[in-house]
Amino acid sequence: LPGVGLTPSAAQTARQHPKMHLAHSTLKPAAHLIGDPSKQNSLLWRANTDRAFLQDGFSLSNNSLLVPTSGIYFVYSQVVFSGKAYSPKATSSPLYLAHEVQLFSSQYPFHVPLLSSQKMVYPGLQEPWLHSMYHGAAFQLTQGDQLSTHTDGIPHLVLSPSTVFFGAFAL
Amino acid sequence: LPGVGLTPSAAQTARQHPKMHLAHSTLKPAAHLIGDPSKQNSLLWRANTDRAFLQDGFSLSNNSLLVPTSGIYFVYSQVVFSGKAYSPKATSSPLYLAHEVQLFSSQYPFHVPLLSSQKMVYPGLQEPWLHSMYHGAAFQLTQGDQLSTHTDGIPHLVLSPSTVFFGAFAL
Amino acid sequence: LPGVGLTPSAAQTARQHPKMHLAHSTLKPAAHLIGDPSKQNSLLWRANTDRAFLQDGFSLSNNSLLVPTSGIYFVYSQVVFSGKAYSPKATSSPLYLAHEVQLFSSQYPFHVPLLSSQKMVYPGLQEPWLHSMYHGAAFQLTQGDQLSTHTDGIPHLVLSPSTVFFGAFAL
């Protein structure tokens, strides 16, 4: 895919040129993370590469986005899965693929699912296969909330900046 | 589908009535384009029909959205594909469907993929078939950047204002 | 799924504590609705539970969102469908799944589709099955407009707060 691994990226350029003319005078918290393509059997989010960025208070800690201020945020994520080299051997049962954005808040002692998408693919019947999942919605979040993801089918992820990403912005 | 091809659309109505009460006093760049249903073997974006619009500096040139001012934008697109006319001879070979939003910037001499979704369909196996793809994310863009799309499977697009669209808005 | 049915939810907490520090001083109309899991053969939207909320003028009436002020809104929705109980006799007939966000406006005497996603699944061929649909876009809406949804395949919905939802926010 073209444009992968560019340095400096436009994201970095924008940060390096604070006087650059911005459309809107009041910055709002925003973040866009991409899946680290060098980690094939895990999904590690990166903010310092390609089109990824953290702005106006968002931070990335323990693979989670930390909400900088209370308010309503639009939260989104996408994954793309594929299969070819992995072939089901002695089964025609489907492969379960799922991707979830979760909230960990001081209010509750467990992860609350915010966004969930799921798919069964039948790799023995249809091979090669490709599947994309996207979701996003508006949530009322509190300062200090942690946004993270959980994925079933990580070995099948197509890790590139335009296919696997996770982000949020304040409304 | 009801509501397709209405003139004047609400989009046009809003432009024709500048004094109409708006929720928010500061306009921000925003655009929503729809695929031209009269062009069956290409994907041409239109802004002057149905629910489509260009606001506060966005323009459409050479089938690309031109970013009016630097800042963070949420960019999104959807396509719906369908098929029925495949012959049984096509059973073993899948059809590759993909949709990508690309950035062409003065910073790089090529198109950078921002958003990519992909799917393999097996038309002989499952006929008729329908498949939807959607994606969207926040990106730091620069005045003059060009946003365009690339689609694999254009002959299979279901071209209507509610199924095939492309848009962006400043945060 | 953890976190389903929590009371008070963070959404409610935020409403109950108006002095809570918000990221941004100017509230804008926003809404996030979830499908009522207690209604298995219909899709009833709820705003008073889990992560759902109505803010700054949005209201829910006759299962429709009422637009509080004219302007541009980002409108989104997701559904997840699943199936298992089909018998092999069903192999030849696909199941049509679709989800649409519709606009009913004083300008037109019928529902205009804003966002449509569609899928054919072949349950006898691939069982169990799961499928997710998401879409969202920016639209120019007028005070009093009604946003609603229409779904084909309601008995197959996976009704949980993170899988079936519908929302909008002013830009």
Partner: antibody
């Protein structure tokens, strides 16, 4: 290295119950179905059923429906087989397997006897 | 349910012999759209778990010696050991993964002559 390790077998009274565990390591557990297969002494292989740990979906051999229950704990990468109303003819080595990759556990012996 | 019938139920052979085991299914295991047969062959030694040898009727699993081969399509399948080795004395099972419930053949025991 990929491993499936069964445990929980042993001597059970007729009419009793037992829960077998299948601990997976060395691969991503949640997306791939875990199958349960048993083998009575000196006999062939018999498929009991399977579970998709991530989704919770199950498929049962009709012969075991009502007596066998599959479950999984994704946080522990472990699948479980609960067998109730055990009879002497349930005496067997119980295996868990991942047919997607072709992995099998070493098996655990269940003896139903008074 | 799909019935799987193996033959012979046992056979005696010597090291170096060519051995053929057949497996018949009561209905076709060929998935027409991708031309794959959902049939696997396993080897089991006493006190051990079954080991996958062949899947999709003819694809050798990684690490399986080339003397093992699978063939056939539809309802008739064959496992061939081109030159029997001492470590090959075991019981062999075919299994269909085409439909539920998964079913196995009754097994073929390969013994030393």
């Amino acid at each position: 290295e990929v491993q499936l390790v069964e445990s929980g077998g042993g001597l059970v009274q007729p009419g009793g119950s037992l829960r077998l565990s299948c601990a997976a390591s060395g691969y991503t557990f949640s997306s791939y179905w875990i199958e349960w297969v048993r083998q009575a002494p000196g006999k062939g292989l018999e498929w009991v059923g399977e579970i998709s740990p991530g989704s919770g979906s199950t498929n049962y051999n009709e012969e075991f429906k009502g007596r066998a229950t599959f479950s999984a704990d994704n946080s522990k990468n472990t699948a479980y087989l609960q067998m109730n109303s055990l009879r002497a003819e349930d005496t067997a080595v119980y295996y868990c397997a991942d047919g997607y990759h072709g992995y099998w556990g070493q098996g655990t012996l269940v003896t139903v006897s008074s | 349910d799909i019935q799987m019938t193996q033959s012979p139920s046992s056979l005696s052979a010597s090291v170096g012999d060519r051995v053929t085991i057949t497996c018949k299914s009561s209905q076709s295991l060929l998935y027409s759209t991708n031309q794959k047969n959902f049939l696997a062959w396993y080897q089991q030694k006493p006190g051990k778990a079954p080991k996958l040898l062949i899947y999709w009727a003819s694809t050798r699993d990684s690490g399986v010696p080339s003397r093992f081969s699978g063939s056939g399509s539809g309802t008739d399948f064959t496992l061939t050991i081109s030159s029997l080795q001492p470590e090959d004395f075991a019981t062999y099972y075919c299994q269909q993964a085409y439909s539920y419930p998964r079913t196995f053949g009754q097994g073929t025991k390969v013994e030393i002559k």
